[in-house]
Amino acid sequence: EEELQVIQPDKSVLVAAGETATLRCTATSLIPVGPIQWFRGAGPGRELIYNQKEGHFPRVTTVSDLTKRNNMDFSIRIGNITPADAGTYYCVKFRKGSPDDVEFKSGAGTELSVRAKPSAPVVSGPAARATPQHTVSFTCESHGFSPRDITLKWFKNGNELSDFQTNVDPVGESVSYSIHSTAKVVLTREDVHSQVICEVAHVTLQGDPLRGTANLSETIRVPPTLEVTQQPVRAENQVNVTCQVRKFYPQRLQLTWLENGNVSRTETASTVTENKDGTYNWMSWLLVNVSAHRDDVKLTCQVEHDGQPAVSKSHDLKVSAHPKEQGSNTAAENTGSNERNIY
């Protein structure tokens, strides 16, 4: 009678993470008597996957009933496959012996490859806000995919970016991989509504590439432009001075009026108007009773935007032509501007 052969018909098996792998193995004879064992890897460091005789292998089930006397099918199923299960699996026939069974013959091995989807890309921007014309860095990360081949692209408002560096780790063989990419983006004043997108494509993805996004509204700071103007006289001895605060982002802004260097009023931007580009406009006015001043008045509109050093614009108010009165009466009002962006 011909000597027993262990047949593993599949040179390689490909399985998706989370699925079940079937590893096929048949013997050509019932003799010699003895159990089958499955190992991952070869040599002294091999890992026992299944032992027909003894042990507890919760993820492994046999395809056929190994207790039947004439059974020659020793195929197994391994459930809930992860990338860590990748490797070459050997079906090994043992001959019954005393005290221990003796390895008799091994199959040629089946290489199990696992395909795993990349995680959703996570895009993160700089910790601090930056102003237009500055270059900021964004990072994109995705993990857990296999095989290693992956493509990553960056977009800003649909336009592909070219200034980025990407690494896939580890460099050598691994059960699964991660990708890390850093893109450089130059900010413009119009970027409040802009988005940076990281797009990852992989063989496992049946849909479009996975996307991670970052809104530049969380990154950009557009400093305001100031304009102080004197309006026509409202009434005898009263002058209306306005401070137009234009094209700023984010909204966090505090305005202080100074009369000859002395704080007259401080207010926080509330009823702002939004421009099409996402920046804001705001207007504050100060009603000055010129009769309270003997000399010319230097009015200063001082703005502290988003915690940055204050910027200011001044206006000299001539009072010499007005009749002088005793006492001081300075009133200030604030209103939101109804006008749209004029730039």
Partner: antibody, heavy 116, light 109 residues
Framework: VQLVESGGRLVQPGTPLTLSCTVS????????MGWFRQAPGKGLEYIGI?????SPYYASWVNGRFTISKTSTTMDLKMNSLRSEDTATYFC?????????????WGPGTLVTVSS | DIVMTQTPSSVEAAVGGTVTIKCQAG??????LAWYQQKPGQRPKLLIY???TLESGVPSRFKGSGSGTDYTLTISDLESADAATYYC???????????FGGGTEVVVK
Amino acid sequence: VQLVESGGRLVQPGTPLTLSCTVSGFSLSSYVMGWFRQAPGKGLEYIGIISSSGSPYYASWVNGRFTISKTSTTMDLKMNSLRSEDTATYFCARVGPLGVDYFNIWGPGTLVTVSS
Amino acid sequence: DIVMTQTPSSVEAAVGGTVTIKCQAGQSINSYLAWYQQKPGQRPKLLIYYASTLESGVPSRFKGSGSGTDYTLTISDLESADAATYYCQSWHYISRSYAFGGGTEVVVK
């Protein structure tokens, strides 16, 4: 799991034609689908795919002449201004469950003949 | 686009014999290669994917191997039912595009 192409017929050059691929046994929202063609006595040629989410991608030679779209149970190939060299059997196919690198289910094909 | 060069264009072998078909990609395709069998008037049938993985139900007489740019389909213990045209198909993970080889007609004597 089944794919069946329809719409193939004899048309004159310059005529538009739309082919359909009707699927059963699975959802088009779960798989990438592709269109291929085979001229008489020639090899297989890739036309384009549509992703599970409905985005089409085309072979570089297509140049806007063909459009792939889908509904819940059918995938269409709209062909503009057909030429005699478009005469072929057109196949639809589904990618495998493990990845988009191979096609494991094919339709029987539908014949398009472009001739005056 | 990647060009797939398949050789030979035709091969003849006897029943019980072995046939080897080669496919060379214009650049590395990282084992993203499938083999199909097509008989006259029929649809293509997937045999092997990811260079060496046998599709369910396909006899183990069909064996795929190779990596990088060079791939091989070996059919052993030829049967008359194996008479068909065989195509290789690549997928390029960067361009996300597909390409076919020109086909190999296998004649079984």
